[in-house]
């Protein structure tokens, strides 16, 4: 009879075991769907929010035709300055032709000076080659003005109007770039 | 958080090709870039290639031409597509996910370039 009630309570203590398991990885679920949907609110308040302003480019940003440029307030050297606008979803300034160098040097003129930017062109060590970032090749017309003697990593920067070569490990402002979002009206 | 998870590494001959993946799991919608860095044995990691979510690509001077950077949005993965490699392209490939705060590496994956 002692041994029919101690196996009793031995099952009873098990189904408790397993009640409290089960609850616990309710609670569990419930705490990662409320997570998820806190998530899921932010994500929706930022696309909501993008929509509601509708503009092309972020704030502090400059457009023009399709594209925006943000300009930066700090120095880096060439490597860090890239990966500052990977950080905003965008490259280092690719310049496509004359008119977009025009009005590059033109708002900088505005904003800031005549001070030294990154852009995102550099020279290949071993052939000597200017490339842009996405490996495409300067226009003939837009390649820096003069060759750096360094024997480190060279890279293009806009000063004034012109387009110029230096040490990457120098500090300089930089101008990043991103596509302008399309109005959807 | 954004967790990261490569694969694809492993070893080939000089001239050969390999394709790594990086796929994506976690507060994604918080990523403006991701990109692939190495580090070889006693160097510095260093970027190889990145892209951003309009699909911008940017990459090394030393694997222009060689290597190609992709996304799938649809699978949240990037991919590396390494052609002609050389020894010099041996090393450990992260994957990294660029926001506007914290930047999320994945734990890499071993690339050997040997005959």
């Known amino acids: 009879k002692l041994l029919q009630v101690s196996t009793i309570a031995m099952q009873q203590q098990e189904k408790l075991i397993q009640q409290e398991r089960a609850l616990l990885n309710f609670t569990e679920w419930k705490r990662s769907c409320a997570l998820q949907m806190k998530y899921c609110q932010a994500f929706m308040q930022n696309s909501l929010s993008s929509a509601h302003n509708s503009s092309p480019c972020p704030n502090n940003w400059i457009q023009n035709r399709e594209s925006c440029y943000y300009v930066s307030e700090i120095w880096s050297i060439w490597h860090t300055s890239q990966e500052n606008c990977l950080k905003e979803g965008s490259t280092l300034l690719q310049i496509e032709s004359k008119e977009e160098m025009d009005f590059i040097t033109g708002s900088l003129r505005k904003i800031k000076g005549s001070y030294d930017y990154w852009v995102g062109l550099s020279q290949d060590g071993h052939s000597g080659r200017w490339l842009w970032q996405d490996g495409s090749s300067p226009s003939p017309g837009l390649l820096p003005a003069e060759r750096s003697q360094s024997a480190n990593q060279v890279c293009g920067y806009v000063k004034s109007n012109s387009l110029l070569s230096s040490n990457c490990s120098t500090w300089k402002y930089f101008i990043c770039e991103k596509y302008a979002l399309r109005s959807s009206v | 958080d954004v967790q990261l998870v490569e694969s694809g590494g492993g070893l080939v001959q000089p001239g050969g090709s390999l394709r790594l993946s990086c796929a994506a799991s976690?507060?994604?919608?918080?990523?403006?870039?991701m990109g692939w860095y190495r580090q070889a044995p006693g160097k510095q990691r260093e970027l190889v290639a990145a892209?951003?979510?309009?699909?911008?690509?940017t990459y090394a001077d030393s694997v222009k031409g060689r290597f190609t950077i992709s996304r799938d949005n649809a699978k949240n993965t990037v991919y590396l597509q390494m052609n002609s490699l050389r020894p010099e392209d041996t090393a450990v490939y992260y994957c990294k996910a660029f926001t506007r705060g914290d930047d999320y590496w994945g734990q890499g994956t071993l690339v050997t370039v040997s005959s």
């Open positions: 892209i951003t979510n309009q699909g911008a690509p």
């Open positions: 976690g507060r994604i919608f918080s990523v403006n870039a």
